[in-house]
């Protein structure tokens, strides 16, 4: 199973292959190569992938991952039971739904099994790392001669999501966008019947249940107007 590793975001300090840690003089720790950062995403609260850049290691190394939850009934250290691989080297760990506890501090530890003192421990707030599936079943209703309403569904608790609707006509060079709260419906009050419109939606786990920064993928687009409006002036649903 190959995985795609998200690339760094241009921080100039991360370009070096390694650094020597400069610890206070009374430290017992030895200078060691740093381990790669672990990045976790919770996909629709169905599973979680925690990945790292295995190619940042000076030589191919099967790093191991352990995790636990701080101050909870789930504070027992767990070994990763489902590793992800990149070119036959461990590059991530996949956790299943029963192992995900959104509102407890998630602690993840990466370790070099050949040098056990070489380890890095991170803490994560999983509720800020949720990425929902893209919205589905987009439908358009003509409420009046000039007003359209767009509806969609999410495979998740609807009140936890905010949405971003984008639309444009065939005459537009760019999208117009509108934020929508958990109600997952959007009205366009003034529609030009001579134009063909395209709509799409994406969703985010924010702000009621978490503070995620990452949006879902865009939905499949749905179109209205021009030819399609003649077929059924009152309803047009996306055909997958």
């Amino acid at each position: 199973l190959n995985t795609t590793i998200l690339t760094p975001n241009g921080n100039e300090d991360t370009t070096a292959d390694f650094f020597l840690t400069t610890m206070p003089t009374d430290s017992l720790s030895v200078s060691t190569l740093p381990l790669p950062e672990v990045q976790c995403f919770v996909f629709n609260v169905e599973y979680m992938n925690c990945t790292w850049n295995s190619s940042s290691e000076p030589q191919p190394t099967n790093l191991t991952l352990h995790y636990w939850y701080k101050n909870s009934d789930n504070d027992k250290v767990q070994k990763c039971s489902h590793y992800l691989f990149s070119e036959e080297i461990t590059s991530g760990c996949q956790l299943q739904k029963k192992e995900i506890h959104l509102y407890q501090t998630f602690v993840v530890q990466l370790q070099d099994p050949r040098e056990p003192r070489r380890q890095a421990t991170q803490m994560l707030k999983l509720q800020n790392l949720v990425i929902p599936w893209a919205p589905e079943n987009l439908t358009l209703h003509k409420l009046s001669e000039s007003q359209l309403e767009l509806n969609w569904n999410n495979r998740f608790l609807n009140h936890c999501l905010e949405h971003l609707v984008q639309y444009r006509t065939d005459w537009d060079h760019s999208w117009t966008e509108q934020s929508v709260d958990y109600r997952h419906k959007f009205s366009l009050p003034s529609v030009d019947g001579q134009k063909r419109y395209t709509f799409r939606v994406r969703s985010r786990f924010n702000p009621l249940c978490g503070s995620a920064q990452h949006w879902s993928e865009w939905s499949h687009p749905i179109h209205w107007g021009s030819n399609t409006s003649k077929e059924n002036p009152f309803l047009f649903a996306l055909e997958a």
Epitope: Q119, T121, L124, K125, N128
Partner: nanobody, 126 residues
Framework: QVQLVESGGGLVQAGGSLRLSCAAS????????MGWFRQAPGKEREYVAI???????FYADSVEGRFTFSRDNAKNEVYLQMNSLQPEDTAVYYC????????????????????WGQGTQVTVSS
Amino acid sequence: QVQLVESGGGLVQAGGSLRLSCAASGRTLSRYAMGWFRQAPGKEREYVAIDSWGGDTFYADSVEGRFTFSRDNAKNEVYLQMNSLQPEDTAVYYCAGAPTSFATTAYSSSNSYRYWGQGTQVTVSS
């Protein structure tokens, strides 16, 4: 290179407050994971408060609800507000920083930090 300099330590009575500051020079901290650690005589260094540059902050159990981490990227400084201090809080307090690629990275392991200050002594008398 980043230089970190702590200040604000001192002697305080139990129940009192102190505010530690950590000033950075040489590079902006806006994309650094930062941490406050402490080391009491004869004990291992332990994390007190850690923070990702995305704003996720975590505290050690022993200080939760009493200590508050904050950062001011414009001033290139981080702070540790310490309230309701107890004798067990007596230690040398260190500020540490690590450049990170991801906004969510917060390290509780001291060996993950690249840069360290020289430390500031905090003594809480009973």
